[in-house]
C-alpha cells in the first residue's frame, strides 16, 4: 500500500516583503526521500523544478528556489509540491510574496521574517484544484501583490 505523503510547507527567506531588486529564496520542505520539488505560482502557467534536494533534518528534506533580483512581476502567491516515488504530494498552502518599492525610510523594515505556509486540510474537490483561478496584479501603497478571487 502506498504511504500517505504529508503536505509540503513553503517559506521565504529573508521574508515575504522584499524590496525591488533584492533577492528572495523560497524554501520548500517535505519528508526524506523527495526526488523533485516543484514551485508553482497561482494563476500562472510557469513553474520551476529542482532535483537539488538536501536533508534539512533527520525527517525532512528541502529545496531552495532563489530569485536574485525581485521585480514587480514576481509578486503573488507561490506554492510547493513534491514527487516522492511513485507519486506526487498534495500542494502546500500558498505563500504571498509582496514586492516593495525602496523608499529609503529608516522606520520601515525591509522584510517580514519567519513567513511560511504549512500543511492544512486539503480541499475536498481535488479534481478542480490543481491551479487557482486567474488573478490580476494590483499596486497599492507601493506594495506589489496579487488580489485573490476565491
Amino acid at each position: 500500500q502506498e504511504e500517505d505523503l504529508p503536505r509540503p510547507s513553503i517559506s521565504a527567506e529573508p521574508g515575504t516583503v522584499i524590496p525591488l531588486g533584492s533577492h528572495v529564496t523560497f524554501v520548500c520542505r517535505g519528508p526524506v526521500g523527495v526526488q523533485t520539488f516543484r514551485l508553482e505560482r497561482e494563476s500562472r502557467s510557469t513553474y520551476n523544478d529542482t532535483e537539488d534536494v538536501s536533508q534539512a533534518s533527520p525527517s525532512e528534506s528541502e529545496a531552495r528556489f532563489r530569485i536574485d533580483s525581485v521585480s514587480e512581476g514576481n509578486a503573488g502567491p507561490y506554492r510547493c509540491i513534491y514527487y516522492k516515488p511513485p507519486k506526487w504530494s498534495e500542494q502546500s498552502d500558498y505563500l504571498e510574496l509582496l514586492v516593495k518599492e525602496t523608499s529609503g525610510g529608516p522606520d520601515s523594515p525591509d522584510t517580514e521574517p519567519g513567513s511560511s505556509a504549512g500543511p492544512t486540510q486539503r480541499p475536498s474537490d481535488n479534481s478542480h484544484n490543481e491551479h487557482a483561478p486567474a488573478s490580476q496584479g494590483l499596486k497599492a501603497e507601493h506594495l506589489y501583490h496579487h488580489h485573490h478571487h476565491h
Partner: antibody, heavy 117, light 111 residues
C-alpha cells in the same frame, strides 16, 4: 531524444472498446501533463482530455463517459468505451513544454482509428 | 466549458506580407494559451505558449499577444513555408475547469 508516440489505432466495429497508448521516451513522464487530441479527416483539432503530472484527469464535456484516460510511469492510455463511426480520426498525444503548462511542444505522429461496420 | 472563436477561417496573403489571426475566449484564461501550426499529414507544431512566448526554434516573425479573453497571432515577412493551418488552444486547468478547447483553425494561403 525526447519523444511521445501513439499506438493501438486500428479498424474496429462500432461499440468495440479500443485502447490507445501514448508512450514516453527520453524523459521522465511523472513531471508532465499529457493531453489527447483528435482530428477527423479534413477537420480541425479537437481536445479530448488530459492527464496531469499530479494525477488529475480532465475531459472535454463531450468526452465524459465516452473515454477514460489513465497513466502509468511510462504511458498514458486513452480507452474508448463504445466508439461510434463519428470517432473515426487520427489521435494525437502531446506533452507540455518544460517550465510552462500552457503549451504542448512534443507531439506524436498520431495513430489512425477507423470505426466502421 | 470555455469556447474559443478563431477568425478568420481562411486568409490569403503575398510573400513578404503580414497575416493577423485572432482568437477570442468566452472566459478569461489569463495567459494559459498557445498557438500551433499544422501542415497536411503532419502533427501540430507549437509556435507560441504563454500567449506571447516564442517556442524553441520558431522564428521571431511569429508574434503572439494578448491575455484574458483576446489573443492575436501575427505572422510577418511571410514565406511560402508559412502556408498551413493555424490553431489556438486554451490550456487553463484551474479551480474552474475550462477544458483545453481549440479554435476552429485558420487556413493561411501564400500567394
Amino acid at each position: 531524444e525526447q519523444s511521445v508516440e501513439e499506438s493501438g489505432g486500428r479498424l474496429v466495429t462500432p461499440g468495440t472498446p479500443l485502447t490507445l497508448t501514448c508512450t514516453a521516451s527520453g524523459f521522465s513522464l511523472y513531471k508532465y501533463n499529457i493531453q489527447w487530441v483528435r482530428q477527423a479527416p479534413g477537420k480541425g483539432l479537437e481536445y479530448i482530455g488530459a492527464s496531469t503530472y499530479a494525477g488529475y484527469t480532465y475531459y472535454a464535456s463531450w468526452a465524459i463517459g465516452r473515454v477514460t484516460i489513465s497513466r502509468t510511469s511510462t504511458t498514458v492510455d486513452l480507452k474508448m468505451t463504445s466508439p461510434t463511426t463519428e470517432d473515426t480520426a487520427t489521435y494525437f498525444c502531446a506533452r507540455h513544454i518544460d517550465g510552462d503548462y500552457s503549451g504542448y511542444a512534443l507531439w506524436g505522429p498520431g495513430t489512425l482509428v477507423t470505426i466502421s461496420s | 466549458e470555455l469556447d474559443l472563436t478563431q477568425t478568420p477561417a481562411s486568409v490569403s496573403a503575398a510573400v513578404g506580407g503580414t497575416v493577423t489571426i485572432k482568437c477570442q475566449a468566452s472566459q478569461s484564461i489569463d495567459t494559459w494559451f498557445g498557438w500551433y501550426q499544422q501542415k497536411p499529414g503532419q502533427s501540430p507544431k507549437l509556435l507560441i505558449y504563454g500567449a506571447s512566448k516564442l517556442a524553441s526554434g520558431v522564428p521571431p516573425r511569429f508574434k503572439g499577444s494578448g491575455s484574458g479573453t483576446e489573443f492575436t497571432l501575427t505572422i510577418s515577412d511571410l514565406e511560402c513555408a508559412d502556408a498551413a493551418t493555424y490553431y489556438c488552444q486554451n490550456t487553463y486547468y484551474g479551480v474552474r475547469y475550462l477544458g483545453g478547447a481549440f479554435g476552429g483553425g485558420t487556413e493561411v494561403e501564400i500567394k
